[in-house]
């Protein structure tokens, strides 16, 4: 969603003309640098310095090869569409020396009835139509080709799949006389994979299906289907894995019950129950078998679908996810937060931590935020001293011995990382918080006070002196 803000009205820069790559003259060797490092051991700084100097020395001869942009390709099969019947598509930046492919599913909530889909169409059309998509996009975070911004997979083939189906990537119904909108999220993924096979994916070693928010849930719903699709098409050697960011929601009780009128006020279960019918939503087959007919909505919730998945999935989830709090009707704009809200928030963190207990590969910082993997600061957050790119690298390494992730991470290379401190932003590496009213940056202590945090009570709960607790908060421990 970042980097998507300049798409219709802005007149700063016309899109560049489509690039055609000049073919080398007959008999000329084609240079390629297959720098596909699976793991970088030893001195990371020295490695980065070498990469930088190599990049700089290559830059004059091939400036356009270092272009950060992913280029738009609308699907050739125009029957696979966005909500309004316009063709779906994907943005691609190839990396010819690499056998890794990263397919990223965009997020952006959903709509679940005619009224809120109409309203979405009139205010957020880019999430329902490809008619005004820009020709290029810049890859950020895990989609960046800069080693500094993406130490994890900077050299991979990058694919960004825009979300234009409003169905949490689950739908399989086309636009018709009866249906004003098409909901084809699941089919869009299948078609993108099919088209990419002709663009080099056929030679892939690893396909990482990633996504944020609704895209993160989309990963959980589609990763096994993609693996099955590739097997059926004759590519069983491609290892399919998932990376679900901010898509692991709880079907919990709302803080304040509200009628299911609008997307953001509707309880998670209500919204998905309605949506799955409206979209003709599909869920993973093994999960579907666990629930009786009409109960398929359960499979949209990570902790219920995860145990049924065959593909390895890495789960990234803020313990205090803003989208979860929004659907739970916890709005942190009043000041201070009431005690009931504060307890509800703490309990949410506890519940979420509980659901991640048996997730082999996870990264769950105790922060109040939403989405991370395509943010440029995604390298900055740490859990127990390990950053997300590092944890992903450790997860990757665990596959080298066996096809299935080994249960025990290597010493000093963990990938099950869940914060255990109990409050939002008790982790000092959390993204900066700003006072919602003044816009000023706040430290952890200020933030917690702002939220109505009672030092006396909490110190008592934790069995420590209030002064010691305040000191800990100020130091960010």
């Amino acid at each position: 969603s970042e980097g998507r803000k300049t798409w219709r009205r802005r007149g700063q820069q016309p899109p560049p003309p489509p690039r055609t790559e000049a073919a080398p003259a007959a008999g000329q060797p084609v240079e390629s640098f297959p720098l596909d490092f699976t793991a970088v051991e030893g001195n990371m700084d020295s490695f980065m310095a070498q990469v930088k100097s190599l990049a700089q020395s290559l830059y004059p001869c091939s400036a356009q090869q270092l272009n950060e942009d992913l280029r738009l390709h609308l699907l050739l099969n125009t029957s696979v569409t966005c909500n309004d019947g316009s063709p779906a598509g994907y943005y691609l930046k190839e990396s010819r020396g690499s056998r890794r492919w990263l397919l990223f599913l965009e997020g952006g909530w959903y709509c679940f009835n005619r009224e809120n889909c109409d309203s979405r169409y009139d205010t957020m059309r880019r999430l329902m139509s490809s008619r005004d998509w820009p020709r290029t996009r810049t890859g950020t975070g895990i989609l960046s080709s800069q080693p500094e911004e993406n130490p994890y997979w900077w050299n991979a083939n990058m694919v960004f799949i825009p979300y234009c189906s409003s169905d949490v990537w689950s739908g399989a119904s086309s636009k018709s006389e009866k249906n004003e909108y098409a909901f084809m999220g699941a089919l869009i993924i299948q078609e993108v994979v099919r088209e990419l096979l002709g663009r080099g994916l056929s030679g892939a070693k690893v396909l990482l299906l990633a996504g944020s928010s609704a895209g993160g849930t989309g990963v959980l719903l589609n990763v096994d289907r993609v693996a099955e699709q590739l097997e059926k098409l004759g590519y069983p050697a491609i290892q399919v894995r998932g990376l679900a960011d901010s898509g692991w929601f709880l079907d919990n009780k709302q803080y304040r019950r509200s009628d299911c009128i609008d997307t953001i006020n509707c309880a998670p279960t209500d919204a998905i129950r309605r949506g799955i019918r409206y979209w003709s939503g599909m869920v993973p087959e093994r999960c579907q078998r666990q629930f009786k007919e009409g109960e398929e909505w359960n499979c949209f919730f990570g902790y219920k679908v995860y145990p049924t998945l065959r593909c390895p999935v890495f789960v990234v989830q803020w313990l205090f996810d803003e989208a979860q709090l929004t659907v739970d009707n916890v709005h942190l704009t009043g000041q201070p937060v009431q005690e009931g809200q504060w307890l509800y928030i703490q309990n949410l963190g506890r519940e979420l931590r509980g659901t991640l207990k048996d997730v082999q590969a996870s990264f769950a910082p105790a922060c109040l935020s939403h989405e991370i993997i395509i943010r440029s600061y995604w390298t900055d957050v740490q859990v127990k001293g390990t950053s997300l790119p590092r944890a992903l690298h450790c997860w990757d390494r665990s596959f080298h011995d066996s096809h299935k992730a080994s249960k025990t991470p290597m010493k000093g290379c963990p990938f099950h990382l869940v914060d255990s401190c109990p409050w939002p932003h008790c982790n000092p590496s959390c993204p900066t918080i700003r006072d919602q009213f003044t816009g000023q940056e706040m430290n952890v202590a200020q933030f917690l006070m702002h939220m109505g945090f009672d030092v006396q009570t909490v110190a008592q709960q934790q069995g420590m002196e209030p002064s010691k607790l305040l000191g800990m908060l100020s130091n960010g421990n």
Epitope: S1, R8, R9, W109, D118, S119, Y121, D122, T123
Partner: antibody, heavy 119, light 111 residues
């Protein structure tokens, strides 16, 4: 040139009815959600109602629910607002506004039509 | 419904100085990287005119002395340097969900 032109205002007795129109030109009318916004004398702006681009969904502010009917004729590029059981507090300048579909902001407004409800 | 609280109700600013208007939402109006807050200027006898959309984007034809910032539930409109012709009432508006609402307005007077 994008233009919106409201008409139909005037003096109406309390309990009476009135139909306001908004004629659009210079853009593909059926591509845009349309809204009515009103402004009582010396007061601020109040959002009143929304019609989706296809005309299939309408939504009203609580203050007018049950007394207003919004409709549109995309073939004639016209938006209508039918008002019944009018009260003195409905006295206002009524503006028709086009909502941009990349954010829902009102990027084009009509000049407004003035409605006075008084005996 | 989302309530927008605008402040101050009125302000007087000297020519060439900075005018700052605040708009607070009762809950977050930001989602998927966008903030659904917009700013309008209205002069007596005229319809409102769009200045800033999606919290910080300047509408074409609007002078660069107008700027918007903020995210979540807190937003600001800045005018610097203020000019004579900026005397008007300014409104914030959200389009995050239906029903849309407006702030109560801020009347700017030039000293």
């Amino acid at each position: 040139d994008v233009q919106l032109l409201e008409s139909g205002g005037g003096l109406v007795q309390p309990g009476g009815s009135r139909k306001l129109s908004c004629a659009a030109s210079g853009f593909t009318f059926s591509d845009f959600g349309m809204h009515w916004v009103r402004q009582a004398p010396e007061k601020g702006l109040e959002w009143v109602a929304y019609s989706s681009s296809g005309g299939t969904t309408v939504y009203y502010a609580d203050t007018v629910k049950g007394r207003l009917t919004l409709s549109r004729d995309n073939s004639k590029n016209t938006l209508f607002l039918e008002m019944t059981s009018l009260r003195s507090e409905d006295t206002a300048m009524y503006y028709c506004a086009r909502a941009s579909y990349d954010g829902g902001y009102f990027d084009c407004w009509g000049q407004g039509t003035s409605l006075t409800v008084s005996s | 419904d989302i309530v927008l609280t605008q402040s101050p109700a009125s302000l007087a600013v000297s020519l060439g100085q900075r005018a700052t208007i605040s708009c607070r939402a009762s809950k977050s109006v930001s989602t998927s990287g966008y903030s659904y807050i917009h700013w309008y200027q209205q002069k007596p006898g005229q319809p409102p005119k769009l200045l800033i959309y999606l919290a910080s984007d300047l509408e074409s034809g609007v002078p660069a002395r107008f700027s918007g910032s903020g995210s979540g539930a807190a937003f600001t409109l800045n005018i610097h340097p203020v000019e004579e012709e900026d005397a008007a009432t300014y409104y914030c508006h959200h389009s995050r969900e239906l029903p849309f609402t407006f702030g109560s307005g801020t009347k700017l007077e030039i000293k």
